[in-house]
Interface confidence: low
Amino acid sequence: EEELQVIQPEKSVSVAAGDSATLNCTVSSLIPVGPIQWFRGAGPGRELIYNLKEGHFPRVTPVSDPTKRNNMDFSIRISNITPADAGTYYCVKFRKGSPDVELKSGAGTELSVRAKPSAPVVSGPAVRATAEHTVSFTCESHGFSPRDITLKWFKNGNELSDVQTNVDPAGKSVSYSIRSTARVVLTRRDVHSQVICEVAHVTLQGDPLRGTANLSEAIRVPPFLEVTQQSMRADNQVNVTCQVTKFYPQRLQLTWLENGNVSRTEMASALPENKDGTYNWTSWLLVNVSAHRDDVKLTCQVEHDGQPAVNKSFSVKVSAHPKEQGSNTAAENTGTNERNIY
């Protein structure tokens, strides 16, 4: 008599998570009499997936009616597939007996489950860095299968090449994770820049998934300082300006010192943005020249974003300004008038 064949025609089947998987199996003969069972895996640790005679298998249904006479199709459908269902499934013929004896196994069908990667999450450096420094951004996405995946980095539309990417685990798994680090060299113009991490995978039917990070969270643009004297006013007051330009973020404290003594402290707030995302701030100090015997050393001291203070000094030459007759010559500071230019 012809030897019984158990035919599993597909070596592999790939299914999206949440879909149903059909695992085909036919036998070439009705004899000998005995049941068919489905297992995941081989050997002593194999897992029973479906047994027509007994057991409760709520997610598994036969494709054709196994009770009808002369049925030789023992294909099954597994519903609501998850990555945990991945593995090799064997259709096994038993000879009826007490107990039933395993007679022949099909070649097996490998079920791979396609699971979408999670939305990429991009994280930047913990502390800000200045222009010309390199900062690292990390992108992570999890829970995808199969392992093949493409990840690309872009900064303002340009693909980045200084990238290191790892997919874990290295061996077989029900799902995988990707972690990629991109190194970006900052420029002073990067306040409005953005990095994008783009993940493409077999499960994504349209555009890749994207995660973004703004370089504004990673960059510090230190200010330029300039102290200038305006022409002296008729009332013997000299207008001194401290221009603080092109800085980011806005967190900035400005202190005026007269001959080393604190005259006034101001905090920047609600400044308008420049086109490149940086800020400018101008502070004015009125110095009453007639209140001073000697030259006045004015210092504009700027503390930006918690960094060490930056100073710019300017000497107002008192000798160059003749004092008014009978004016009070005691060293008193009347320079309390100020204006902020926004």
């Epitope: 790939s14 093949d148 493409t150 493409a200 077999v202 499960t203 039917q205 349209g206 555009d207 890749p208």
Partner: antibody, heavy 123, light 107 residues
Framework: QIQLVQSGPELRKPGETVKISCKAS????????MNWVKQAPGKVLKWMGF????????TYADDFKGRFAFSLETSASTAYLQINNLKNEDTATYFC????????????????WGQGTSLTVSS | DIVMTQSQKFMSTSIGDRVSVTCKAS??????LAWYQQKPGQSPKALIF???YRYIGVPDRFTGSGSGTDFTLTITNVQSEDLAEYFC?????????FGAGTKLELK
């Protein structure tokens, strides 16, 4: 580096069959769809369709249904374009071109191209 | 089918100039638009995808812009190696379609 290398120029008579190959290297072949594009002399580039290298399923543009067949030899990272019952108007350069990493996505932008295979059909 | 119109078949330029190649889609394609450069006897070379993203290795003198139906490829400081034909292509809707091309030549 990533390369798509196509087979050499072909001269055929009307009614014959031709099979053009495109061998990919430098990347994971089954991660990117392979498209075919026709460039006839003096005519606009014409997208013929693509084959999903992950599933082997071909998709043809309407003008290329019937006499045209895309196939794969995955183990050799090679895609094929076969044209049956050749006509004079099949005279053109045929390019294979890879779709960016969109896998199952229908088409996309083409980041790498083969050097092209010139086909001349003449009696 | 979506028709991609490149109204200028030829454009004359000088080395160092700035030139803009335009492309119009017959219907909205979002930003699913790519630009290619082709030199005689060569295969097309990918320049831009998603309307404005440069491929790695493409000089930053090439800039893509636009969305919806109107797109522009701008080349600033044109170099001699930029003298070639430029094609746009939409990949929003099947069938994927190309523009007829714009040839950049010296004045």
């Amino acid at each position: 580096q990533i390369q798509l290398v196509q087979s050499g120029p072909e001269l055929r008579k009307p009614g014959e069959t031709v099979k053009i190959s495109c061998k990919a290297s430098g990347y994971s072949f089954t991660n990117y769809a392979m498209n075919w594009v026709k460039q006839a002399p003096g005519k606009v580039l014409k997208w013929m369709g693509f084959i999903n290298t992950y599933t082997g399923e071909p998709t043809y543009a309407d003008d290329f249904k019937g006499r045209f067949a895309f196939s794969l030899e995955t183990s050799a990272s090679t895609a094929y374009l076969q044209i049956n019952n050749l006509k004079n108007e099949d005279t053109a350069t045929y390019f294979c071109t890879r779709t960016r990493g969109y896998y199952d996505f229908d088409g996309g932008a083409f980041d790498y191209w083969g050097q092209g295979t010139s086909l001349t059909v003449s009696s | 089918d979506i028709v991609m119109t490149q109204s200028q078949k030829f454009m004359s330029t000088s080395i160092g100039d700035r030139v803009s190649v335009t492309c119009k889609a017959s219907q909205n394609v979002g930003t699913h638009l790519a630009w290619y450069q082709q030199k005689p006897g060569q295969s097309p070379k990918a320049l831009i995808f998603s309307a404005s993203y440069r491929y790695i290795g493409v000089p930053d003198r090439f800039t893509g812009s636009g969305s919806g139906t109107d797109f522009t490829l701008t080349i600033t400081n044109v170099q001699s190696e930029d003298l070639a034909e430029y094609f746009c292509q939409q990949y929003n809707t099947y069938p994927l379609t190309f523009g007829a091309g714009t040839k950049l030549e010296l004045k």
